[in-house]
């Protein structure tokens, strides 16, 4: 190798200056005794190199690029060799930003996968390889004192979420959780969450069903629907409140919300609806009165209200 480039820093803040030096060894005898060293950033020749001969006979050229405005570029030093440019050495330059503080960190406990899933927003593009690590520890109190550290959770490339498996969790005990972002220009940390995994539990919704008509029960009145639901068994012992939503299948009507309903109701008569109309219904539940996340809405149930009221009357709810 005849030439060697060294740079003040291969990775800088976007727009910052960068200084580079290219040294050509004396024993490259096939070169001119006084070769002119040229600089190129990407495909563009860069003026402003200051060249000098050092005491040991080597040639050095120093260039300062006042603003590196490319997020990635190759800087090369070269010599004119006949009619072509002979590249002696090149380095990759990167420019970008230190990571912003990750924000909107939130977690939910999935009882099906037995894991705590946390997600965050990484902030603006840094233009540099940036790693995110979900860090956590167990705490007996309100996370002021740190207990056992939990193995770092590293998301797959490009993902802004990570799952902490059950073996690293302790339910009904607080955990300190935060995200650390790191790249060549710096490190940042999100504000710390302090939570008990059970307080962010997200349940599966019940399954809506049509109520089987029983011989002794009166049929639904006009504009009423009888429905029941099957709770999600693994969450059965968790106190919950639920809500229904419904809308006519035809037309542009928005969802109407009914609730809160106790999970234990298990069946319900919904009235005040249009007669002889097909409705779409869904249900969702949340741990309550203790904290939790709403479940997703259940798969839809489609039911049709009756055309006219039966002659006899029975107790029903109005909505």
């Amino acid at each position: 190798e005849c030439g060697h480039i060294s740079v003040s820093a291969p990775i800088v803040h976007l727009g910052d200056p960068i200084t580079a030096s290219c040294i050509i060894k004396q024993n490259c005898s096939h070169l001119d005794p006084e070769p002119q060293i040229l600089w190129r950033l990407g495909a563009e020749l860069q003026p402003g190199g200051r060249q000098q001969r050092l005491s040991d006979g080597t040639q050095e050229s120093i260039i300062t690029l006042p603003h590196l405005n490319h997020t990635q570029a190759f800087l090369s030093c070269a010599l004119n060799w006949g009619n072509s440019l002979q590249i002696l050495d090149q380095v990759e330059l990167r420019a970008g930003y230190p990571p912003a503080i990750p924000h909107n960190l939130s977690c939910l406990m999935n009882l099906t996968t037995s894991s705590l899933i946390c997600q965050w927003e990484p902030g603006p593009e840094t233009h540099l390889p940036t790693s995110f690590t979900l860090k956590s520890f167990k705490s007996r109190g309100n996370c002021q004192t740190q207990g056992d550290s939990i193995l770092d959770c590293v998301p797959k490339d490009g993902q802004s979420h990570c799952s902490i498996p059950r073996k690293h969790l302790l339910l009904y005990q607080n955990m300190g959780i935060w995200v650390q972002a790191e790249n060549a220009l710096g490190t940042s940390m999100s504000p710390q969450l302090c939570l008990d995994p059970m307080d962010v539990v997200k349940l599966e919704p019940p399954m809506l069903r049509t109520m089987d008509p029983s011989p002794e029960a009166a049929p639904p009145q006009a504009g009423c629907l009888q429905l029941s639901w099957e709770p999600w068994q693994p969450g059965l012992h968790i106190n919950q409140k639920c809500e229904l939503r419904h809308k006519p299948q035809r037309g542009e009507a928005s969802w109407a919300l009914v609730g809160p309903l106790p999970l234990e109701a298990l069946q319900y008569e919904l009235c005040g609806l249009l007669p002889a109309t097909a409705y779409t219904l869904q249900i969702r539940c949340i741990r309550w009165p203790l904290p939790g996340h709403w479940s997703d809405w259940s798969p839809s149930l489609e039911l049709r209200t009756t055309e006219r009221a039966p002659t006899h009357h029975h107790h029903h709810h109005h909505h």
């Epitope: 009882l111 099906t112 996968t113 037995s114 059950r166 073996k167 339910l171 059970m198 709770p231 068994q233 693994p234 059965l236 012992h237 968790i238 106190n239 106790p262 234990e264 109701a265 298990l266 009165p289």
Partner: antibody, heavy 118, light 107 residues
């Protein structure tokens, strides 16, 4: 401190009835599922029945379905097990227990012995 | 119904031994597996809930692992007070079932 105290056990003839009670203290009784578990002499544990916090859901083991009824009185912090048509195989120590949110039993009462014999 | 099979039904061990008890569910139960200890003439006591969570006040020599269908209770160094019968229980769905029990005896 959470405490559960069963009562009502004793000797009863086959076909007879008995009502077990479990008095709870030290926690908000109305917020928790409760359950009964029994243990025949020298045998393992057998779940009998559970009841939801407000009493609306009451699953039973097949072996007692139609004969036993679980109930609760949240105003008295008391759990009950009404046992009818008793059989010799119902002879056991009956424990009442508080259920955790993910279905575990903790704590347990000290147990009450039910003996069905002629 | 989900059946719970516990093994071994009994074992002999010495103080200081590492003891492992297994529990197998007839179908997947996620992490809904609890472990209890019972001493003669006493009510059962909860050791581990949700497969691996140590109940408050239970010594750290007890640990639980597994998910799906296969679960393990481990006592890392058996102490004199640990000689008892151990039961697993599934709480994934009704009817809730207990394993047949494992009696840990002094060798």
């Amino acid at each position: 401190e959470v405490q559960l105290l069963e009562s009502g056990g004793g000797l009863v003839q086959p076909g007879g009835s008995l009502r077990l009670s479990c008095a709870a203290s030290g926690f908000t009784f109305s917020l928790y599922w409760m359950g009964w578990v029994r243990q025949a002499p020298g045998k393992g544990l057998e779940w009998v029945s559970s009841i939801s916090s407000s009493g609306g859901v009451t699953p039973y083991a097949d072996s007692v379905k139609g004969r036993f009824t679980i109930s609760r009185d949240n105003s008295k912090n008391t759990l009950y097990l009404q046992m009818n048509s008793l059989r010799a195989e119902d002879t056991a120590v009956y424990y009442c227990a508080k259920l955790g949110e993910l279905g575990w039993f903790d704590p347990w009462g000290q147990g009450t012995l039910v003996t069905v014999s002629s | 119904d989900i059946q719970m099979t516990q093994s071994p039904s009994s074992l002999s061990a010495s103080v200081g031994d590492r003891v492992t008890i297994t529990c197998r569910a007839s179908q997947g139960i996620s992490s809904y597996l609890n472990w209890y200890q019972q001493k003669p003439g006493k009510a059962p006591k909860l050791l581990i809930y949700y497969a691996s969570n140590l109940q408050n006040g239970v010594p750290s020599r007890f640990s639980g692992s597994g998910s799906g269908t296969d679960f393990t209770l481990t006592i890392s160094s058996l102490q004199p007070e640990d000689f008892a019968t151990y039961y697993c229980q599934q709480s994934y769905s009704y009817p809730q079932k207990f394993g047949g029990g494992t009696k840990v005896e002094i060798k």
